[in-house]
């Protein structure tokens, strides 16, 4: 669809008549002086001469004169008002690329190197300095110490889970992260001792210290990563560290 | 966050003990447990027992046999009963909200169990 | 259970002084302490949590330390409105328990 749709333009011809004025002249007419005789009158004679030319007549009315040629087109007219729009036409080929602002292609593309360098440096950072990476999981921690409940808000505030390690080399990136003991995404609360993790789906490693998990109290529904990198069953009420894993 | 116990001052040997723990300013159920704590004359605190956000309990096992900790939501309210009292269960009563420590308590109740 | 013993029982300074309050858990917590203070009449506060951590609003004159079974609530040049009574908390192992107190008093 065109963005300014054209607008019909009405042009009127304006044929200006033209006319010829034709003037017809009529004969003066003649005058005879009367003639006295004494004499029985004879018969006439015969026609005198002609007299001399009469006074000119008045103006005779305009004759009926030939119509003359067409003239020349009148000027041109003012614009009459829009027609209605006209149904939509067929759809246009495909244009042609556009240019860049500056004429540059390439200017987006090395700009957009340039971010996506300056982004892997930042990850770089970030795992020297506060998480740890194995695989396509990054480990973060803020160092604050919370309950589960906050943990979770706080992980899917940032569009991440509660870190939960899948495998030894998992377990180990969390524990070598973490000074003191750190929460699991892992809890039992919906079926008593069947740990699952926040997704529903039930574990495939697991790493338990020696007689856990023990429901002690019998609210020990969450589980701990304890500094030695072993698990331990407490309940989600307490304040532990909040680890974070984040998906790359 | 505050909490506030109400209850009887005085409880006859052998009776329940019933307690109420009125929370204002959070909902009992968004998060942390909820629980009782009293302080006998000797100033010695006792940790008694929780409900937690999600409505689980947990009490301690010297007092597992006749104590019992439940909670109205409706009301923000949760409540302690203490049954078969003796004259040694005479105390300051507390409740408080707890994450690992005890970070909001009431005012406390003096509760006196005397013939 | 987790016994949790505070030394001295009662403890008599002078406004000014630097003091260090004990607590000794029966068996290793790990760093799972917390520390209250409760004058005459008033419920007990949270002055410390897991052993050093620093509780928003609690002057920085109290610090805590230690880790295992060992933990020291120090309070550097006491102030009159610190008397009153400490206790020490442990979170490690179910059922909750504190200790026994210490009584800090004037001189």
């Known amino acids: 669809m065109s963005l300014f749709p054209s607008l019909p333009l009405l042009l009127l011809s304006m044929v200006a008549a033209s006319y010829s004025e034709t003037v017809t002249c009529e004969d003066a007419q003649k005058t005879c002086p009367a003639v006295i005789a004494c004499s029985s009158p004879g018969i006439n004679g015969f026609p005198g001469k002609d007299g001399r030319d009469g006074t000119k007549g008045e103006k005779g009315e305009p004759g009926q004169g030939l119509r003359g040629l067409q003239g020349p087109p009148g000027k041109l007219g003012p614009p009459g008002n829009p027609g209605p729009s006209g149904s939509p036409g067929p759809k246009g080929q495909k244009g042609d690329p556009g240019k860049s602002p500056d004429g540059d292609s390439s200017l987006a593309a090395s700009e957009r190197k340039a971010l996506q360098t300056e982004m892997a440096r930042i990850k770089k950072w970030l795992t020297f300095s506060l998480g740890k990476q194995v695989g396509n999981k990054f480990f973060l921690t803020n160092g604050e110490i919370m309950t589960f409940e906050k943990v979770k808000a706080l992980c899917v505030k940032f569009q991440a889970s509660v870190a939960t390690p899948r495998n030894a080399a998992e377990n180990g990136a969390i524990q070598n992260l973490i000074k003191e003991e750190a929460f699991l995404g892992i809890t039992d609360e919906k079926t008593e001792g069947q740990f699952v993790d926040l997704t529903g789906n039930r574990l495939t490693y697991t790493n338990w210290n020696e007689g856990e998990p023990n429901n002690a109290g019998s609210d020990e529904d969450c589980v701990l990563l304890l500094k030695n990198g072993q698990w331990n069953d407490v309940p989600c009420s307490t304040s532990h560290l909040a680890v974070c894993e984040f998906p790359i | 966050v505050q909490l506030q116990e109400s209850g009887p001052g005085l409880v006859k040997p052998s009776q329940s003990l019933s307690l109420t723990c009125t929370v204002t300013g959070y909902s009992i159920t968004s998060d942390y447990a909820w629980n009782w704590i009293r302080q006998f004359p000797g100033n010695k605190l006792e940790w008694m027992g929780y409900?937690?956000?999600?409505?689980?309990?947990s009490y301690n096992p010297s007092l597992k046999s006749r104590v019992s900790i439940t909670r109205d939501t409706s009301k923000n309210q949760f409540f302690l009963q203490l049954n078969s009292v003796t004259t040694e269960d005479t105390a300051t009563y507390y409740c408080a909200r707890w994450e690992s420590w005890f970070a909001y308590w009431g005012q406390g109740t003096l509760v006196t169990v005397s013939a | 259970d987790i016994v949790l013993t505070q030394s001295p029982a009662t403890l008599s300074v002078t406004p000014g002084d630097s003091v260090s309050l004990s607590c000794r858990a029966s068996q290793s917590i790990s760093n799972d302490l917390h520390w209250y203070q409760q004058k005459s009449h008033e419920s007990p506060r949270l002055l410390i949590k897991?052993?050093?951590q620093s509780i928003s609003g609690i002057p920085s004159r109290f610090s805590g330390s230690g880790s295992g079974t060992d933990f020291t609530l120090s309070i550097n040049s006491v102030e009159t409105e610190d008397f009153g009574m400490y206790f020490c908390?442990?979170?490690?192992?179910?059922?909750?328990?504190f200790g026994g107190g210490t009584k800090l008093e004037i001189k």
């Open positions: 897991y052993a050093s």
């Open positions: 908390q442990q979170s490690n192992s179910w059922p909750y328990t």
């Open positions: 409900i937690s956000y999600s409505g689980s309990t």
